[in-house]
């Protein structure tokens, strides 16, 4: 049994880091393998993660990290019984993938303005709380070409757009994702999408 593709890990910088790797053949990850992880700190606790299958030869492990700071560095040991298959390290702050925003809502009752709001996925005491920026994706269910991205570079989790920038009388969907420049993170996953019917009063044309 050998590791074909070494573990790569990302952290949500809150409570979970996810590591994925591939074995050289079909593997029952949860029964055959264990990923041990420990903060590089002489009095730290060693923890064991039981991996799950992620495709035939792929494994994924969700490492619980109750508290993360930028100084943290973890040792990772992948074991198959008594055999050490791989040894590595992981610094969560250098591999951050933020949590996806939630509770995306489209408020259509503001005069001819669409107000999109969502929730910051972090609590106020987390470092990322004040460092997230967002991308909002809006698309038409009827017209695949009607697809747009709005970059929200301010901290407030909301976006206002004129309803007239979208076509009237058709349904749209929106979703939002986050990233943090401070840790050069990857983008989060998209939030679940929300749907609304776009309608607005055409301005009366005078002749």
């Amino acid at each position: 049994m050998k590791v074909l593709q070494e573990p790569t890990c990302v952290s949500d910088y809150m409570s979970i880091s996810t590591c994925e790797w591939k074995m050289n053949g079909p593997t029952n990850c949860s029964t055959e393998l264990r990923l041990l992880y420990q903060l590089v700190f002489l009095l730290s606790e060693a923890h064991t993660c039981i991996p799950e299958n992620n495709g035939g030869a792929g494994c994924v492990c969700h490492l619980l990290m109750d508290d993360v700071v930028s100084a943290d560095n973890y040792t990772l040991d992948l074991w198959a019984g008594q055999q050490l298959l791989w040894k590595g390290s992981f610094k969560p702050s250098e591999h951050v993938k933020p949590r996806a925003p939630g509770n995306l809502t489209v408020h259509t009752n503001v005069s001819d303005t669409l107000l999109l709001t969502w929730s910051n996925p972090y609590p106020p005491d987390n470092y990322l709380y004040n460092h997230l920026t967002y991308a909002v994706n809006i698309w038409s269910e009827n017209d695949p070409a009607d697809f747009r991205i709005y970059n929200v570079t301010y901290l407030e989790p909301s976006l206002r757009i004129a309803a007239s920038t979208l076509k009237s009388g058709i349904s749209y969907r929106a979703r939002v994702r986050a990233w943090a420049q401070c840790y050069n993170t990857t983008w989060s996953e998209w939030s679940p999408s929300t749907k609304w019917h776009n309608s607005y009063r055409e301005p009366f044309e005078q002749h």
Partner: antibody, heavy 118, light 111 residues
Framework: EVRLVESGGGLVQPKGSLKLSCEAS????????MNWVRQAPGKGLEWITH??????????YYADSVKDRFIISRDDSESMVYLQMNNLKTEDTAMYYC?????????WGQGTSVTVSS | DIVLTQSPASLAVFLGQRATISCRAS??????????MHWYQQKAGQPPKLLIY???NLESGVPARFSGSGSGTDFTLNIHPVEEEDAATYYC?????????FGSGTKLEMK
């Protein structure tokens, strides 16, 4: 919010026994090493004992001043840490704090007071 | 055991000035790129509160006027500018090995 609440302190005679409890909440208790630190009236801080997590076989460590008299234990299912204190001496009079250890002793309870006097 | 020698034992400074507290370890508390020295503030009738961990990292929620530096055996806590609410006793502490030990404390007062 991380909370540690100590209880069980009080007045006890020399050579007597006392059991302190610490209730933890607001964090994944089973992942952390837990400690007791004490502070005699008007004095500095003294670490006295440490218990590791299940994955580290609940290993325990003691300061020389309490070795063979004090026993630390934990119950992960109840998020509790205990300190059984036997053969108490007058010099054990102190405020006893339950403390979580991660990179440092980062969260402290409010403490419970123990007085050893005849 | 690692002995931590803190100085001065007490310190009086004017509001807005700098307070500097030193902590010397009897052997190095640094290894693998980390310095396992930490600083606490304790006010009367309260438990200690973590200010600085791993020599120089500010604990969440602690004002930026607190800073820590040092490596090996010599460490420093700086408070600048000192405010009225900073009157307290400050302790250094190492977690390099067991037994964990503390400095004897520095009492900070305002002039």
């Amino acid at each position: 919010e991380v909370r540690l609440v100590e209880s069980g302190g009080g007045l006890v005679q020399p050579k007597g026994s006392l059991k302190l409890s610490c209730e933890a909440s607001g964090f994944s208790f089973n992942m952390y090493a837990m400690n007791w630190v004490r502070q005699a009236p008007g004095k500095g801080l003294e670490w006295i004992t440490h218990i590791r997590s299940k994955s580290n076989n609940y290993a325990t460590y003691y300061a020389d001043s309490v070795k063979d008299r004090f026993i630390i234990s934990r119950d992960d299912s109840e998020s509790m840490v205990y300190l059984q204190m036997n053969n108490l001496k007058t010099e054990d009079t102190a405020m006893y704090y339950c403390v979580r250890l991660l990179r440092a002793l980062d969260y402290w309870g409010q403490g419970t007071s123990v007085t050893v006097s005849s | 055991d690692i002995v931590l020698t803190q100085s001065p034992a007490s310190l009086a400074v004017f509001l807005g000035q700098r307070a500097t507290i030193s902590c010397r370890a009897s052997k190095s508390v640094s290894t693998s790129g980390y310095s396992y020295m930490h600083w606490y503030q304790q006010k009367a009738g309260q438990p200690p509160k973590l200010l600085i961990y791993l020599a120089s990292n500010l604990e969440s929620g602690v004002p930026a006027r607190f800073s820590g530096s040092g490596s090996g055996t010599d460490f420093t806590l700086n408070i600048h500018p000192v405010e009225e609410e900073d009157a307290a006793t400050y302790y250094c502490h190492h977690s390099r090995e067991l037994p964990i030990t503390f400095g004897s404390g520095t009492k900070l007062e305002m002039k």
